[in-house]
Interface confidence: low
């Protein structure tokens, strides 16, 4: 498939707070956002993140399958027994002002087409597209049991989409993303990504004070 | 003063979407969030950001006084005539669940005390403290005309506060931040910062598509 096998690239997901809007999804209390910035990851031979990541000063932490930290930071004694799979990704977008709202059905169809054709993600993994102007939410869901050999991972699809939206396309020699709904350009001004793991993350209550 | 003179440290501000809650502030449409991740900044001899920043591959952009990008990225022909001042900062926090909501007056007083005593920020620059459980918003305002010699810059105070909240205190040889309201620990689980400049930022409509 053409979307990345090397999910280790996913280093730029951004942080956000949940929305309280009516038709939008409220991220789970266990949802992760990447607020650690960039780091130089350890990858296994297949290009997956190693469950434990450490920096040059031997501070270590556990990550999920998209490389986002899911534990407190510790020292070299920290153990990460398994790479926990991210099975639900919520991509939260805010589009630039338009003459009117996009038609929800048209928007839904266009985004599903995009994930199918550009990122080669099987349509069954795009669980929902929510819209309340100017916020769009795309839900990707993919359990371990659902993912067959050759299926693009939702983490890879989300990462390629994120980079496309930011005008930093990872597709060599292909045009940048020109996203349109019924001919009207869809211009994204903010992208926020939440990751939900099959096993809830483990943070102490006191980690930030 | 003990808070940083070197505002060039401010590299980790995070991105978010505006809140629609009743008693909370809605950031201006011109508010900036730093969604570019870390970069190695050019600083002037006084430790201020140079108006133009470029990365190692010579992509350049203009920044404000807290180092957040305020123009589209361009090439080496890009000119940034002046360092535009950030005069309004909105710090948006979400605290961890507590038995009940904090008393707004107590919370307001404690945060004002913290900014005055720990970050040496003159009380007149803390414009407001808003609270709607679990969201706290601290508004800092400081026009060029208001800032006297020796006054701590709101950008420095915000940066030191952000690092304290994240358990990464920049105060050498002083204890970490133990924030309490009437003895009850205030544990922050998410921090989002918006920056508003004296001159609105200049982004093209098409910058992300």
């Amino acid at each position: 498939h053409t979307a990345a096998q090397d999910n280790c690239l996913l280093l730029k997901a951004r942080m956000s707070a949940p929305k309280n809007a009516r038709t939008l999804v409220r991220p789970s209390e266990h949802a992760l956002v990447d607020n650690d910035g960039l780091y130089d990851p350890d990858c296994d031979p297949e290009g997956r993140f190693k469950a434990r990541q450490c920096n040059q000063t031997s501070v270590c932490w556990c990550v999920n399958s998209v490389g986002v930290r899911r534990t407190d930071k510790g020292d070299l004694s920290l153990r990460c027994d398994e790479l926990v799979r991210t099975h639900h990704i919520l991509i939260d977008l805010r589009h630039r002002p338009t003459a009117g709202a996009f038609n929800h059905s048209d928007l839904d169809a266009e985004l599903r087409r995009l994930f199918r054709e550009r990122y080669r993600l099987h349509p069954k993994f795009v669980a929902a597209v929510h819209y309340e102007q100017p916020t769009i939410q795309i839900e990707l869901r993919q359990n371990t049991s659902q993912k067959a050999a050759g299926d693009v991972d939702i983490g890879d699809a989300a990462y390629y989409f994120e980079r496309d939206i930011k005008g930093e396309s990872l597709f060599q020699g292909r045009g940048g993303l020109d996203l349109r709904v019924r001919g009207e350009p869809l211009q994204v001004e903010r992208t926020l990504i939440y990751y939900l793991d099959e096993i809830p993350p483990k943070f102490s209550m006191k980690r930030l004070t | 003063h003990t808070a940083a003179q070197d505002n060039c440290l401010l590299l980790k501000a995070r991105m978010s979407a505006p809140k629609n809650a009743r008693t909370l502030v809605r950031p201006s449409e011109h508010a900036l969030v730093d969604n570019d991740g870390l970069y190695d900044p050019d600083c002037d001899p006084e430790g201020r950001f140079k108006a133009r920043q470029c990365n190692q591959t010579s992509v350049c952009w203009c920044v404000n006084s807290v180092g957040v990008r305020r123009t589209d990225k361009g090439d080496l022909s890009l000119r940034c005539d002046e360092l535009v001042r950030t005069h309004h900062i909105l710090i948006d926090l979400r605290h961890r669940p507590t038995a009940g909501a904090f008393n707004h007056s107590d919370l307001d007083a404690e945060l004002r005390r913290l900014f005055r005593e720990r970050y040496r920020l003159h009380p007149k620059f803390v414009a407001a403290v808003h609270y709607e459980q679990p969201t706290i918003q601290i508004e800092l305002r400081q026009n060029t005309s208001q800032k006297a010699a020796g006054d701590v810059d709101i950008g420095d105070a915000a940066y030191y506060f952000e690092r304290d909240i994240k358990g990464e205190s920049l105060f050498q040889g002083r204890g970490g931040l133990d924030l309490r309201v009437r003895g009850e620990p205030l544990q922050v689980e998410r921090t989002l910062i918006y920056y508003l400049d004296e001159i609105p930022p200049k982004f093209s409509m098409k910058r992300l598509t």
């Epitope: - | 190692q56 080496l76 022909s77």
Partner: antibody, heavy 121, light 107 residues
Framework: QIQLVQSGPELKKPGETVKISCKAS????????MNWVKQAPGKGLKWMGW????????TYAEEFKGRFAFSLETSASTAYLQINNLKKEDTATYFC??????????????WGAGTTVTVSS | DIVMTQSHKFMSTSVGDRVSITCKAS??????VAWYQQKPGQSPKVLIY???YRYTGVPDRFTGSGSGTDFTFTISRVQAEDLAVYYC?????????FGAGTKLELK
């Protein structure tokens, strides 16, 4: 492999026009800007300007505004430098160099072999 | 325009020597300086960009340093094939400008 192949040497008279070519191969032509650099005999390197290979928009250094023109034939992955109303001081070797814009590499990582233009009456 | 000044037009050296070439910018160019090697009858070849980053495939005997206005290019152990003209170039702002070049020759 990545290379820039320039057209052969030119001998011209003052007042004539010359058009030299630079054909790119081994990479996506429109992903990198094309720069032109002049080197007079026994002298150093002088940046003439560049052309945005995505949009075709040229940018000229002050000294090279007027008689000099950059152009493209994108389908052939080729950039051109045309010099009108040639003068003796245009005698030089002209190099094309791959550079960039946007995600910008403004040093030149790939160079053509150079085209020598001699202007003599 | 930013002027790049290479103080030595010629430098004499011997095989195995360490040699440093300096370049001074007329104004602050951060770390945006590249170094090129040009041999007679050939096109220039980039060795260093962004002051200290060695371009792909360039031997590690070539190093660069500096920031702001003062830059240095060093060959730790000169080899016969290193005899050439070396140019600095600022890639900070257009118009891009080169130094006049320093010719490295044998003593």
């Amino acid at each position: 492999q990545i290379q820039l192949v320039q057209s052969g040497p030119e001998l011209k008279k003052p007042g004539e026009t010359v058009k030299i070519s630079c054909k790119a191969s081994g990479y996506t032509f429109t992903n990198y800007g094309m720069n032109w650099v002049k080197q007079a005999p026994g002298k150093g390197l002088k940046w003439m300007g560049w052309i945005n290979t995505k949009t075709g928009e040229p940018t000229y250094a002050e000294e090279f505004k007027g008689r000099f023109a950059f152009s493209l034939e994108t389908s052939a992955s080729t950039a051109y430098l045309q010099i009108n109303n040639l003068k003796k001081e245009d005698t030089a070797t002209y190099f094309c160099g791959r550079g960039g814009y946007g995600s910008s590499y403004w040093y030149f990582d790939v160079w053509g072999a150079g085209t020598t233009v001699t202007v003599s009456s | 325009d930013i002027v790049m000044t290479q103080s030595h037009k010629f430098m004499s050296t011997s095989v195995g020597d360490r040699v440093s070439i300096t370049c001074k910018a007329s104004q602050d160019v951060s770390i945006a300086v590249a170094w090129y090697q040009q041999k007679p009858g050939q096109s220039p070849k980039v060795l260093i960009y962004s002051a200290s980053y060695r371009y792909t495939g360039v031997p590690d005997r070539f190093t660069g340093s500096g920031s702001g206005t003062d830059f240095t290019f060093t060959i730790s152990r000169v080899q016969a094939e290193d005899l050439a003209v070396y140019y600095c170039q600022q890639h900070y702002i257009t118009p891009l400008t080169f130094g006049a070049g320093t010719k490295l020759e044998l003593k």
